[in-house]
Interface confidence: medium
């Protein structure tokens, strides 16, 4: 998709729905394309992200993608459909309310990949296993 | 399809409290961010406060007017967005509209009315 | 907070009119702007979000335009049941704040 300063008009009547039934409606996402990060080493990281979006199509949820090599970390941020792949993977955790990071196998880089479709998710980028959790006590600790 | 249905509402003397819900239905609640909306007798819309996922920590915003005496809440298991009210004043009389926030769906309103 | 001012606040046009309302932030929203319709007795209705991407749903003789301090909602051929009050609100900041409202009347 694109962020709101370059959108063009779009009225699709179709109602998006999820495999509950319940109505997909636009997300909220962080949108800042790739940004330099200083997110490295760390059980979870914020994007820093000022740029939260109403994503252009229901069926689109939130993505990051963290990238290192040589010379930098980057993250990007963006809406995404999860039918299309992104960066040629397929969104396998676009259902997760949490953005939980996955590495990729890329040549000549460390890749990490997380979608999820709760608002602002990929605001929060998790990389550790052990966050992966339903303890709301837990989650209160991480994300405060 | 996508329902929200505010209640709790009515009469109650200036410095009283109110409890507002919101009942959601038709889409995955705890995925959303939610917000109140409010609107006095004859004048335009004005933003209330929201609450974020309890994903990302429930966090609450609130504009200023209302700031330390209303509070938002969210029970996901119950798919209901509350709005605690409290030192009511004249001025907080007003319909009372549960949104999905920034997007579509509003509720249809429920009316507050501090006057003694 | 950032002020959304719009203009007029009120007109009264006839039916097939082609209607425009503009609306001003008092600081650069990119944007980050909403337009909402509303009738007496009932919620508003989102009509554009994102300055200028239609809501699904809305007629396409609704647009909207601008970008940083500056908006436009435009109705191209006033219909019957467009009579109403219209809103501007910016969500580029915390707390998003709406504009005056704009009420099209009956000519």
């Known amino acids: 998709t694109i962020p709101p300063h370059v959108q063009k008009s779009v009225n699709n009547d179709m109602i998006v729905t999820d495999n509950n039934g319940a109505v997909k409606f636009p997300q909220l996402c962080k949108f800042c394309d790739v940004r330099f990060s200083t997110c490295d080493n760390q059980k979870s990281c914020m994007s820093n992200c000022s740029i939260t979006s109403i994503c252009e199509k229901p069926q689109e949820v939130c993505v990051a993608v963290w990238r290192k090599n040589d010379e930098n970390i980057t993250l990007e941020t963006v809406c995404h459909d999860p039918k299309l792949p992104y960066h040629d993977f397929i969104l396998e955790d676009a259902a997760s309310p949490k953005c939980i990071m996955k590495e990729k196998k890329k040549p000549g880089e460390t890749f990490f990949m997380c979608s999820c479709s709760s608002d602002e998710c990929n605001d929060n980028i998790i990389f550790s296993e052990e966050y992966n959790t339903s303890n709301p006590d837990l989650l209160l600790v991480i994300f405060q | 399809q996508v329902q929200l249905v505010e209640s709790g509402g009515g009469l109650v003397e200036p410095g009283g409290s109110l409890r507002l819900s919101c009942a959601a239905s038709?889409?995955?609640?705890?995925?959303?961010?939610m917000s109140w909306v409010r609107q006095a007798p004859g004048k335009g819309l004005e933003w209330v406060g929201r609450i974020k996922t309890t994903y990302s920590g429930g966090a609450t915003e609130f504009a200023a007017p209302v700031k330390g005496r209303f509070t938002i809440s969210r029970d996901d298991s119950k798919n209901t967005l509350y709005l605690q009210m409290n030192s009511l004043k004249t001025e907080d009389t007003a319909v009372y509209y549960c949104t999905l926030d920034l997007r579509k769906y509003w509720g249809q309103g429920t009316l507050v009315t501090v006057s003694s | 907070d950032i002020q959304m001012t719009q203009s007029p606040s009120s007109l009264s046009a006839s039916v097939g009119d082609r209607v425009t309302i503009t609306c001003r932030a008092s600081?650069?929203?990119?944007?980050?702007l909403n337009w909402y319709q509303q009738k007496p007795g009932k919620a508003p209705k989102l009509l554009i979000y994102a300055a200028s991407s239609l809501q699904s749903g809305v007629p396409s003789r609704f647009s909207g335009s601008g970008s940083g301090t500056d908006f436009t909602l435009t109705i191209s051929s006033l219909q019957p049941e467009d009579f109403a009050t219209y809103y501007c609100q910016q969500s580029y900041s915390t707390p998003p704040t709406f504009g005056q409202g704009t009420k099209v009347e009956i000519k």
């Open positions: 600081q650069s929203i990119s944007s980050y």
């Open positions: 038709g889409f995955t609640f705890s995925n959303a961010w």
